[in-house]
């Protein structure tokens, strides 16, 4: 089965899709008479011919798009100038401006609270079968083993930090060796990447936003896997990161330094901690094989308590048994010895929600999954349509030309490497790349932000959570300094590794076209976002597993056939967009293949029957929920109350190709006005200027 | 307070059996590990065995090993000891005593004694 | 078995004065020793345990020290009720097991 958007009887499509060399927004030629264009007072770019900017995975070359949708919207000002404004006029417009200032601020720390709430979430549900994934023996010789543990774990966790906190106590503790431990952290730097796709999926209301939203976010994850499929192997024949990391651990004399600075927690924690605080030591201990953890809650219920180191007699079969002979004695029954035990006083109660109910963790996961899945998804609405009043007209000219424009020449090359510099720096102040791209998604989707210059940002992410990873290890107690340290190491120099591969050179930026690709087959069919999510961070992993867990046998037996036909469909994709010539006739397109195996179409209509008794039925409840329902059926007309899915589709039911919602629009309620199907509200009374 | 009172003297024959008794009370008597020592005339003192009466174990001196029987009625907070195929080296004053002092073998509490007198 | 050897078997010494009653474990015991004292027909009384901790209502002119196979019972200034005969005991192993014991009289 392919996953691919309709084959038909496509021929190899000899139109070629442009790309700025800087990593500009691909620029369609000549539309300087569209209303939606990005700004043209645009430094001049050179270009480059590249593939098609969907997928290189993609099997087909759909018809050419009238309308580019990677270009930016242009979000018109609706609203009255300043200089035509009145001082009663002008006061009401800043104290506007200062609410949303306020609004935006609160609903982004609500939305970073949430993202710390589904992570805690995810450890609750997953967390006892995540750390039961580490103990598996295997992982030692199998490093696609220890690959698909460390996404695994990571998108149970919905934490690398956690994955790999749990990876540096079992080098430490020489559970692991590091040479183990380096696939793992690869694949935590996976599956850390999904918590931006799931933000991605809260835009699947408008098809052109959640396209951009969903691309910016599954660069990351294109980013992560190509690296990987390209330096696991490398590692595995040269070790050179553990080579690298091991030289350098070896020649500096590391003291203990101080911890990473908390600067994010530092505001978020007062209000998370009051809705769940978890025992993280837990995981980590069933990852060591405590079977005592097993039955331990992850839900914190005391939060001050007394270690008290005493000694107490304790009964022995024999005297062999006791600690020493001079710790040794009789009642004239019994032999007794003297232990050295650690007595914990538990003193005072965490205060929490689910403190006093005493749920099972399943429970409580389950519950604050729901429920900070509802928050970040509210959130995520507010944040959009406050951005989308605000950043309008000259705001946001400024702000994209600031974002994404690139400095002059000779320098424009420089831009994207400032890029991965800011987007490393955020990240180590907000001591998470989650967050960071979890942020950075929402401005991609309302086009504040190309996915050209969201790629350098979460490339930087990436260095930026490894750079944090490294502090935390200079601040390890002394026998996990080493240990930590040089995994901090290897996470970070596998991420230099694959900037170097996928972004210095733009031909060898694949992930942008990776991603768009899959942006345009999601906008279409907003099902296959789900199905996405699912194949590659959980199916492919638990199969890897499945049969690496059979053993090397059976995963050489199934993985080759497999990797073969991807590389021969990849092999003749290429020929069929580059040179059909050669081919033969019947292999220059893909129409020999039934229908199901080269269209989504046929999967389409089952997964529309599947959903069908939604499509009438769910969406009036709220948006939230119609932003559910509309992932789930991609339905034009279940929508009627909330109006949150409607996407101008009546026009354009019969059309194959995505089709972009008319861009000239500023915003959601305007389009709709002029669609007549709000009452136009007075847009007199609009303020755009902060 | 804790009193320990034992049975009156006996004079047996070599061969024969005794079975000598120690009372309590004063304290919860499946509490504490009972002992059993003997005193040889103008001798040391000797180990025979304890047996603890909340549960019935026996602990023995090998030396007395298939000779003496440790038991305890808990209804009557009563400590017996019965020692067969006595021998003229048997004569001595018999002791009980308990242990207050948890998880040691120093005996804080003595009966008055037994003294058991193997004669032909 | 442990054996315990006490030294001296007896000794004679004027009221007021120091006496000094050592004992020798046959194996380390720790610290997993007592003292007892016995006047003439009577039981033997507990004096000391765990080589150094007094029993209640012990003088404190009675102490104890000493570790693993050398165990002292010191009397600081002897009295007239302090004629008997004191034995040391190990409850290290089974079977306990006293010392011979040492007699101590007033000149």
């Known amino acids: 089965m392919a996953p691919w958007p309709e084959l038909g009887d496509a021929q190899p499509n000899p139109d070629k899709y442009l790309e700025g060399a800087a990593g500009q927004q691909p620029t369609a030629p000549d539309k300087s008479k569209e209303t939606n264009k990005t700004d043209n007072t645009e430094a001049p770019v050179t270009k480059i011919e590249l593939l098609p900017s969907y997928s290189t995975a993609t099997l087909i070359d759909e018809p050419t798009e009238v309308d580019d949708p990677w270009n930016l919207p242009t979000l018109q000002d609706s609203g009255i100038k300043w200089s035509e404004r009145d001082t009663k006029g002008k006061i009401l417009c800043f104290f506007q401006g200062i609410g949303r200032l306020i609004l935006l601020l609160g609903f982004l720390y609500f939305f970073v609270c949430s993202l710390d709430i589904l992570s805690s979430a995810f450890q609750l549900v997953g967390g006892k079968m995540a750390g039961q994934f580490f103990s598996n023996s295997s992982i030692m010789s199998n490093p696609l083993l220890g690959l698909v543990i460390g996404v695994l774990v990571t998108v149970l966790v919905q934490s690398s930090s956690t994955s790999t906190s749990i990876v540096v106590s079992m080098v430490s503790s020489s559970l692991l060796t590091v040479r183990a431990a380096i696939p793992i952290i690869m694949g935590a730097n996976i599956g850390t990447s999904i918590t931006n796709t799931i933000v991605a999926l809260m835009q699947v209301g408008d098809r052109s936003e959640f396209r951009r939203a969903f691309a910016g976010a599954t660069v990351h994850d294109f980013f992560n896997w190509l690296s990987v499929l390209v330096l696991l192997p490398v590692e595995v024949a040269t070790h050179y990161l553990e080579i690298i990391t091991q030289l350098i651990v070896e020649s500096f004399h590391f003291k203990n330094g101080e911890d990473a600075p908390d600067l994010l927690k530092v505001i978020t924690k007062p209000f998370t901690k009051l809705i769940v605080q978890l025992d993280k030591k837990v995981i980590s201990q069933i990852a060591m094989n405590d079977e005592k953890a097993k039955n331990k809650s992850l839900v914190k219920i005391w939060c001050k308590t007394f270690t008290n180191k005493t000694q107490i007699n304790v009964t022995v079969p024999s005297t062999a048994n006791c600690t020493s002979p001079s710790l040794c004695w009789t009642d004239g029954i019994q032999n007794w010895t003297m232990k050295n035990v650690t007595y914990k006083e538990n003193i005072a109660k965490c205060q929490h929600i689910f403190v006093n109910f005493h749920l099972p963790d399943l429970a409580v996961g389950t519950i604050l999954l729901i429920l900070s899945l509802l928050v970040l998804c509210g959130c995520l609405i507010m944040i959009v349509k406050i951005l989308g009043s605000v950043l309008k007209g000259q705001v946001a000219t400024v702000i994209k030309k600031t974002i994404n424009t690139d400095f002059p020449f000779p320098f424009a090359w420089l831009t994207g490497y400032l890029a991965i510099l800011v987007g490393a720096g955020m990240t180590f102040i907000v001591q998470s790349s989650s967050v960071f791209t979890s942020a950075l998604t929402p401005l991609i989707g309302i086009g504040v932000i190309t996915i050209e210059r969201a790629y350098p940002l979460t490339l930087g992410s990436n260095i930026g959570t490894t750079t944090t990873a490294i502090l935390a290890a200079l601040a390890s107690p002394g026998n996990a300094l080493r240990s930590s340290l040089q995994i901090a190491l290897c996470h970070f120099f596998f991420n230099i590794s694959g900037i170097l591969l996928w972004y210095p050179i733009p031909f060898t930026r694949l992930p942008i076209r990776m991603a768009k690709g899959l942006g345009n087959i999601s906008a279409k069919y907003r099902w296959f976002a789900v199905f996405y999510l699912i194949i590659f961070f959980f199916l492919i992993p638990l199969t890897v597993f499945g049969l690496s867990l059979a053993g090397w046998r059976v995963l050489v037996g199934v993985g080759v056939p497999v990797v073969f036909i991807i590389i021969l469909v990849l092999c003749l994709r290429l020929l069929q967009s580059r040179c059909p010539r050669v081919l033969p006739k019947k292999l220059q397109n893909w129409n020999f293949l039934p229908l199901w195996m080269r269209s989504l179409k046929p999967w389409d209509a089952v997964v529309s029957k599947f959903t069908g008794c939604f499509q009438m039925r769910c969406c009036c409840c709220c948006r939230v929920c119609c932003r559910a329902c509309c992932l789930l059926c991609d339905c034009p007309k279940c929508c009627r109350c909330s109006k949150c899915c409607e996407d101008l589709e009546e026009a354009q039911e019969g059309q194959d190709v995505p089709v972009k919602a008319p861009e000239t629009f500023d915003n959601i309620t305007i389009s709709r006005e002029a669609q007549g199907e709000v009452p136009a509200s007075d847009s007199k009374t609009e303020c755009t200027a902060l | 307070q804790v009193q320990l009172v034992q049975s009156g003297a006996e004079v047996v024959k070599p061969g024969a059996s005794v079975k000598m008794s120690c009372k309590t009370s004063g304290y919860t008597f499946i509490t504490y590990n009972m002992h059993w020592v003997r005193q040889a005339p103008g001798q040391g003192l000797e180990w025979i065995g304890a047996i603890y009466p909340g549960s019935g174990d026996t602990s023995y001196n090998q030396k007395f090993k298939g000779r003496v029987t440790l038991t305890a009625d808990k209804s009557t907070s009563t400590a017996y000891m019965e020692l067969s195929s006595l021998r003229s080296e048997d004569t001595a004053v018999y002791y009980c005593s308990i242990s207050t002092i948890i998880t040691t073998g120093a005996v804080d509490y003595w009966g008055q004694g037994t003294l058991v007198t193997v004669s032909s | 078995d442990i054996q315990m050897t006490q030294s001296p078997s007896s000794l004679s010494t004027s009221v007021g004065d120091r006496v000094t009653i050592t004992c020798k474990a046959s194996?380390?015991?720790?610290?997993?020793v007592a003292w007892y004292q016995q006047k003439p027909g009577q039981s033997p009384k507990l004096l000391i345990y765990?080589?150094?901790t007094r029993h209640t209502g012990v003088p404190d002119r009675f102490s104890g020290s000493g570790s693993g196979t050398d165990f002292t019972l010191i009397i600081r200034s002897l009295q007239p009720e302090d004629v008997a005969t004191y034995f040391c005991q190990q409850y290290s192993r089974i079977p306990l097991t006293f010392g011979g014991g040492t007699k101590v009289e007033i000149k």
């Open positions: 194996q380390d015991v720790g610290t997993a």
């Open positions: 765990w080589t150094s």
